[in-house]
């Protein structure tokens, strides 16, 4: 998980950071770009049907450290990544859904998505 804001020197952060926004654009955004004093983020989560939906946008500086920490929420599969190193840096983020815990299998028979390596076809 990238939390580049934690390792980037404060002076390297632009005063105003422009981020790609999708499903999470403020009304005054233009061309799917928002501005913030904090972080850009990209988040993936599952809707009620099990469909993965990606949202991206801006997080204000206040409280964003906590939001970017991606604390697990029981019974909710989601993942968030944040960045600050350059404008629109969140278009390069690629959060992936966390693996299912055993108890989640009550929701149905699931085939795991294997990222970045060969996947044996069932």
């Amino acid at each position: 998980k990238k939390e580049d804001g934690e390792s980037t020197a404060p002076t390297a952060r632009p005063k105003v950071l422009r981020c790609k926004c999708h499903h999470h654009c403020p009304e005054d955004s233009v061309n799917n770009i928002c501005s913030t004093d904090g972080y850009c983020f990209t988040m993936i989560e599952e809707d009620d049907s099990g469909t993965p939906v990606v949202t991206s946008g801006c997080l204000g500086l206040e409280g964003s450290d906590f939001q970017c920490r991606d604390t697990p929420i029981p019974h909710q599969r989601r993942s968030i990544e944040c960045c600050t190193e350059r404008n629109e840096c969140n278009k390069d983020l690629h959060p992936t859904l966390p693996p299912l815990k055993d108890r989640d299998f009550v929701d149905g028979p699931i085939h795991h998505k294997h990222h970045h390596h060969h996947h044996h076809h069932h």
Partner: antibody, heavy 119, light 107 residues
């Protein structure tokens, strides 16, 4: 042999309703999702949404919310696409396509159903 | 939504040629890209999934590669039966989007 066999071509008038079926065989129906993909004449492929064959919960792409409905008859291993209040721009071939739950590539495709909307 | 920019739109090649099709994504997809073949009058057929994995029964002349935003599909030695339209698809996030297609014609 895994197959998705769809119902035959449909000729409809604007404002009418069509219901397309997709009969699955050769695998356990409820362990895969069923997607619907639209292909207008001479055009590319557009994902309309899917229905979770285990839970029965559908999800629709934004362009297909409202007049479109996915449903299942699990006991018959059949998925359905219903389009209400048909418009000229609904003229297309509609494919059902199977996907593993939580994977989103489509490994088996239906035979396709051509819907023509014309007054 | 994620835009898949596929090039070229048309390819006119001779049997035995090597063919390369590219897809560029508007955002990072990791390896969540599939490639399909659609022959005239037929349904699409899965060839490649997870960017580089060949699906069951697909000849090894078909290969895929790439990660992030840039993906490539290659037919190492084109055969007459490869006449078709080829599509890429991102399978990372809803709505799952396809490239506009590449029509492969054989001289």
């Amino acid at each position: 042999q895994i197959q998705l066999v769809q119902s035959g071509p449909e000729l409809k008038k604007p404002g009418e309703t069509v219901k397309i079926s997709c009969k699955a065989s050769g695998y356990t129906f409820t362990t895969y999702g069923m997607n619907w993909v639209k292909q207008a004449p001479g055009k590319g492929l557009k994902w309309m949404g899917w229905i979770n064959s285990y839970s029965g919960v559908p999800a629709y792409a934004d362009d297909f919310k409202g007049r479109f409905a996915f449903s299942l008859e699990t006991f018959a291993s059949t998925a359905y696409l219903q389009i209400n209040n048909l418009r000229d721009e609904d003229t297309a071939t509609y494919f059902c396509a199977r996907s593993e739950l939580r994977n989103w590539y489509f490994d088996v495709w239906g035979t396709g159903t051509t819907v023509t909307v014309s007054s | 939504s994620f835009v898949m920019t596929q090039t070229p739109k048309f390819l006119l090649v001779s049997a035995g040629d090597r063919v390369t099709i590219t897809c560029k994504a508007s955002q990072n997809l990791g390896n969540d890209v599939a490639w399909y073949q659609q022959k005239p009058g037929q349904s699409p057929r899965l060839l490649i999934y997870f960017a580089s994995n060949r699906y069951t029964g697909v000849p090894d002349r078909f290969t895929g590669s790439g990660y992030g935003t840039d993906f490539t599909f290659t037919i190492s030695t084109v055969q007459a039966e490869d006449l078709a339209v080829y599509f890429c698809q991102q399978d990372y996030s809803s709505p799952f989007t396809f490239g506009s297609g590449t029509k492969l014609e054989i001289k």
